[in-house]
């Protein structure tokens, strides 16, 4: 014969536990219903009546089955350096992420506390490791035979063009200048086929970085000549 189905509230078997989407109410000493996401417990259960649930008010939410007396407040609106990637609904909190060109320099449980602008590599330096949502750009000096003439958070060091006749040799921040005959591009970033002095650089390849998490909010302007711009976010 099938086992009898117990309807909430009910007393659990000695040493037993309540079922999925139920909780044990210490006061009533009964297994009672949890409220679904988007709702909260308006009235707790008793020995004879089950939990009474009610919808979350505007700007509040519950994401899980619960028996909380009040819904959680959604986070404040996203700041100017952030975009809202998940709106505040009755079932989920607002999530703010850093806008394009920025990364999260200091995270919080959901979203980002501190956004900062991605580093721009200056001329002579190229991007060694691109920025991500949670890590800054890593720059490296352009190796002999390569150059970068831009200030950019995306440009890598590019090979110098190969000239039949070189008018001006290239360097780390400038491409080679050829005389009137049409130039070609070197395929390998390290290949140097032009009459350019090649210096010996013991550690030109920067150590390979490993993955990171950096997270972001802006409350301070940098002091001093010019590094990172930070943006601020509300919690």
């Amino acid at each position: 014969l099938p086992a009898q189905v117990a309807f909430t509230p009910y007393a659990p078997e000695p040493g037993g536990t309540c079922r999925l989407r139920e909780y044990y109410d210490q006061t009533a000493q009964m297994c009672c219903s949890k409220c679904p996401p988007g709702q909260h417990a308006k009235v707790f259960c008793t020995k004879t009546s089950d939990t009474v649930c009610d919808s979350c008010e505007d700007s509040t939410y519950t994401q899980l089955w619960n028996w909380v007396p009040e819904c959680l407040s959604c986070g404040s609106r996203c700041s100017s350096d952030q975009v809202e990637t998940q709106a505040c609904t009755r079932e989920q909190n607002r999530i703010c992420t850093c806008r394009p060109g920025w990364y999260c320099a200091l995270s919080k449980q959901e979203g980002c506390r501190l956004c900062a602008q991605l580093r721009k590599c200056r001329p002579g330096f190229g991007v060694a490791r691109p920025g991500t949502e949670t890590s800054d750009v890593v720059c490296k000096p352009c190796a002999p035979g390569t150059f970068s003439n831009t200030t950019s958070s995306t440009d890598i060091c590019r090979p110098h063009q190969i000239c039949h006749v070189v008018a001006i040799p290239g360097n780390a921040s400038m491409d080679a200048v050829c005389t009137s005959t049409s130039p070609t591009r070197s395929m390998a970033p390290g290949a140097v086929h032009l009459p350019q002095p090649v210096s010996t650089r013991s550690q030109h390849t920067q150590p390979t970085p490993a993955p990171s998490t950096a997270p972001g909010t802006s409350f301070l302007l940098p002091v001093g000549p010019s590094p990172p711009a930070e943006g601020s976010t509300g919690d």
Epitope: L114, Q203, P209, P222, P227
Partner: antibody, heavy 121, light 107 residues
Framework: EVQLVESGGGLVQPGGSLRLSCAAS????????LSWVRQAPGKGLEWVAY????????YYSDTVKGRFTISRDNAKNTLYLQMNSLRAEDTAVYYC??????????????WGQGTLVTVSS | DIQMTQSPSSLSASVGDRVTITCRTS??????LPWYQQKPGKAPKLLIY???KLAEGVPSRFSGSGSGTDYTLTISSLQPEDFATYYC?????????FGQGTKVEIK
């Protein structure tokens, strides 16, 4: 006001270990690259180690590579230098410095007051 | 490694003098060169960055020039508080070496 305060220096025997800390305040710590620079008594300045803002990229001078480890805790606004296999020639004042914002702003713009490390038997 | 040759190692000058310190690198560092001032018992202080740019709060009597491998720090009119040791440094490939320092003393 930007402040960098080093601690953890002291007297240690050759072959011993020491961990330096640098407590930072007055700026958004997690967005800045940081370094350690040292100065032996009566001598010039020597760059020791660098770590980028997210802690994913570290560089070392050849004199300390394999013995020293730079790290940071962005939640605690603290920079560290773990020094192992210490030698007499590591005796110096160790400065915690902000920068370089490498590849973009290449300089050390703020320095701590320094902490003295003496390696002697 | 890039070698930094700073000269002179020391100099004696009087208040009001024009002082010039030079720094030569073993290869081009593309103006990635700051200058620092250090007084006895104190931490260094940034004076000039990118070879020519004056750091915040630094008096205009300090100036920097140069490119490629040759760089110069000039103090146009030496003041009593300028007696100190000056260092250049490069930020090209690692290791980021400093010059040996120039001690500016009172004549």
């Amino acid at each position: 006001e930007v402040q960098l305060v080093e601690s953890g220096g002291g007297l240690v025997q050759p072959g011993g270990s020491l961990r330096l800390s640098c407590a930072a305040s007055g700026f958004a710590f997690s967005t800045y690259d940081l370094s350690w620079v040292r100065q032996a008594p009566g001598k010039g300045l020597e760059w020791v180690a660098y770590i980028n803002n997210g802690g994913i990229s570290t560089y070392y001078s050849d004199t300390v590579k394999g013995r020293f480890t730079i790290s940071r805790d962005n939640a605690k606004n603290t920079l560290y230098l773990q020094m192992n296999s210490l030698r007499a020639e590591d005796t110096a004042v160790y400065y915690c410095v902000r920068g370089p914002f490498y590849g973009s702003a290449n300089y050390f713009d703020y320095w701590g007051q320094g902490t003295l490390v003496t390696v002697s038997s | 490694d890039i070698q930094m040759t700073q000269s002179p190692s020391s100099l004696s000058a009087s208040v009001g003098d024009r002082v010039t310190i030079t720094c030569r690198t073993s290869e081009s560092i593309y103006s990635n060169l700051p200058w620092y001032q250090q007084k006895p018992g104190k931490a260094p202080k940034l004076l000039i960055y990118d070879a020519t740019k004056l750091a915040e709060g630094v008096p205009s009597r300090f100036s920097g020039s140069g490119s490629g491998t040759d760089y110069t720090l000039t103090i146009s009119s030496l003041q009593p508080e300028d007696f100190a040791t000056y260092y250049c440094q490069h930020f090209w490939v690692t290791p980021w070496t400093f010059g040996q320092g120039t001690k500016v003393e009172i004549k």
